[in-house]
Interface confidence: medium
Amino acid sequence: QPSVSPGEPSPPSIHPAKSELIVRVGNEIRLLCIDPGFVKWTFEILDETNENKQNEWITEKAEATNTGKYTCTNKHGLSSSIYVFVRDPAKLFLVDRSLYGKEDNDTLVRCPLTDPEVTSYSLKGCQGKPLPKDLRFVPDPKAGITIKSVKRAYHRLCLHCSADQEGKSVLSDKFILKVRPAFKAVPVVSVSKASYLLREGEEFTVTCTIKDVSSSVYSTWKRENSQTKLQEKYNSWHHGDFNYERQATLTISSARVNDSGVFMCYANNTFGSANVTTTLEVVDKGFINIFPMINTTVFVNDGENVDLIVEYEAFPKPEHQQWIYMNRTFTDKWEDYPKSENESNIRYVSELHLTRLKGTEGGTYTFLVSNSDVNASIAFNVYVNTKPEILTYDRLVNGMLQCVAAGFPEPTIDWYFCPGTEQRCSASVLPVDVQTLNASGPPFGKLVVQSSIDSSAFKHNGTVECKAYNDVGKTSAYFNFAFKGNNKEQIHPHTLFTPRSHHHHHH
């Protein structure tokens, strides 16, 4: 007996053998699926599906909602379909009013017809308003009307499906198009503060603001170089269409030193990503660091001004500042101000303005500052440079001539003899004795020097000059001598004290 090789399996046959069938409302729908391996009938319209395991599908009284695609499937998974229109003059459109469109994509207005023989199947604006000029659509009686390349401007557009039935225009229920925007830029991210400085145990809270066109933007706080999931809270707001804002707040209720580091707020959408960082520094205790803006040893000339300036870092903020001299606190002449008005500022400046300083006002000037955790201070040693002043010039009973001068820096005393009536004293005389009188006294006052020469060395009439000088200037005093026979006489009443010109020395 010859063997018969079976052919390829074929799809089922449907009776009536048409691709489309029009049935009047109230009439019967009778569809027969012919296939030895029949499995089921499936009916689909909009989001509705029904199944029937009988090979004959019978709907005794057809309704408009029976319009749709009827598919017969066999055991090989092959199928055949017929589309049935149930013509109902009272219900021209089947509608699913949910209408979402993704920007730049096509979207389907789901209003399939129950009568394929109507004309002018199209979209119309609500209340007679025209559709946007650039709106393009493609009608399909079995599916609805496809809007091509949805624009953001179509959001909240109200429209109807429309068709002419027996010369009259019929409108479907209204549709409101909701446009889901496409991401065309990376999210905009910002942070409440770029850096935070806290003490251990204080709360760290930082807010990242993410702005984008829709809420499907992704955002998270991350710790740099760490995979640990951070605890964050979200606030979110729609500030109108396509204007979405989210606030992601990261909180560490009791910060520890090892929480210090860089925290990144990261956001992304389908277009790309963006991030912003903030730095946290946690210290176990507050601190103050003082930086002198001038040398702490200051030399200033008599009568001149000087400003003592410090910059300092203080965290927490400084509570008490003062300038002190000789155990006295300045109530004026100083100012203290933040280096910047930035909320995160920890740097401050303090200035003490000393004016027309006298020789007696040298000494230690101290700046003290404190906050709730620590105290700190810095001292300036101020030396006032003064021209020598000759305090005394005498002929002692033992025949010595003595000159005492004071000034800062320490004066040097030189002696000169002028024979006769010469005005220029050039011959220098070596002193017998030189002493610094107050070297062990206060360190910042004028220094007193005493110098003596032996007057018995002078054999002629003349003048003796005592000249005291330092870096600032010089001062001279004179002793006049006259010989009467063999007696030498110092003429005190006519002794001249003539300050000479002095020069300033600036440091």
């Epitope: 809420s215 964050e232 809270k233 979200y234 606030n235 979110s236 707001w237 729609h238 500030h239 109108g240």
Partner: antibody, heavy 123, light 108 residues
Framework: QVQLVQSGAEVKKPGESLKISCKGS????????IAWVRQMPGKGLEWMGI????????LYSPSFQGQVTISADKSISTAYLQWSSLKASDTAMYYC????????????????WGQGTLVTVSS | DIELTQPPSVSVSPGQTASITCSGD??????ASWYQQKPGQAPVLVIY???KRPSGIPERFSGSNSGNTATLTISGTQAEDEADYYC??????????FGGGTKLTVLG
């Protein structure tokens, strides 16, 4: 001080329309959202929707979308809740409540409430 | 939408601590607030941003929120605290939702 004063009680028949109001004072009305909250007799609070008076941007709870309309007139610092066709099931106390703006530390709390408007719908 | 579940009632003796819970899927990731409503009155905010108290609210009211549960705690409960309490959260889409409410009864 901040105050939200609501319009008086209403008795209506099914199918009638209604518009109730909520007037804000003592703060910048345009910068705070106004929410509407329903409380049916003996029941809990239900959030209906919210409006930002500055630009009249509204958001509705899915349960109330299409059932009511929320609006505002910033020139008179007043928000409104309206129905085009009342049903017996709309009988309830309706509260308006102020919601601080997005950047506020107290978001999203309803920090001040009106005294409520009782709406009774009965044939 | 998020659903919030509260116990219908909680009873407490005067001076004792009352805890009212509010559970919902991952509500710890958003802020919770709590409202007190006495009969015939409008609700009053008692806790916002999980654990912050508005001015004028006694210190005995406190809140917490993590995981799937927010909790309102009233320590040293007083007779005047007897009321209905509602929790509320607002989701990413800015839709707010209230819990079903808890009737707090102060015994005695």
């Amino acid at each position: 001080q901040v105050q939200l004063v609501q319009s008086g009680a209403e008795v209506k028949k099914p199918g009638e329309s209604l518009k109730i109001s909520c007037k804000g004072s003592g703060y910048s009305f345009t910068n705070y959202w106004i929410a509407w909250v329903r409380q049916m007799p003996g029941k809990g609070l239900e959030w209906m929707g919210i409006i930002y008076p500055s630009n009249s941007y509204t958001l509705y709870s899915p349960s109330f979308q299409g059932q009511v309309t929320i609006s505002a007139d910033k020139s008179i610092s007043t928000a409104y809740l309206q129905w085009s066709s009342l049903k017996a099931s709309d009988t309830a106390m309706y509260y308006c409540a102020r919601v601080p703006p997005g950047g506020s530390i107290s978001y999203p709390a309803f920090d001040h409430w009106g005294q409520g408007t009782l709406v009774t719908v009965s044939s | 939408d998020i659903e919030l579940t509260q116990p219908p009632s909680v009873s407490v003796s005067p001076g004792q601590t009352a805890s009212i819970t509010c559970s919902g899927d991952n509500i710890g990731s958003i802020y919770a607030s709590w409202y007190q409503q006495k009969p015939g009155q409008a609700p009053v905010l008692v806790i916002y941003r999980d654990n912050k108290r508005p001015s004028g609210i006694p210190e005995r009211f406190s809140g917490s929120n993590s995981g799937n549960t927010a909790t309102l705690t009233i320590s040293g409960t007083q007779a005047e605290d007897e009321a209905d309490y509602y929790c509320s959260v607002t989701d990413m889409e800015q839709h707010s939702v209230f819990g079903g409410g808890t009737k707090l009864t102060v015994l005695g």
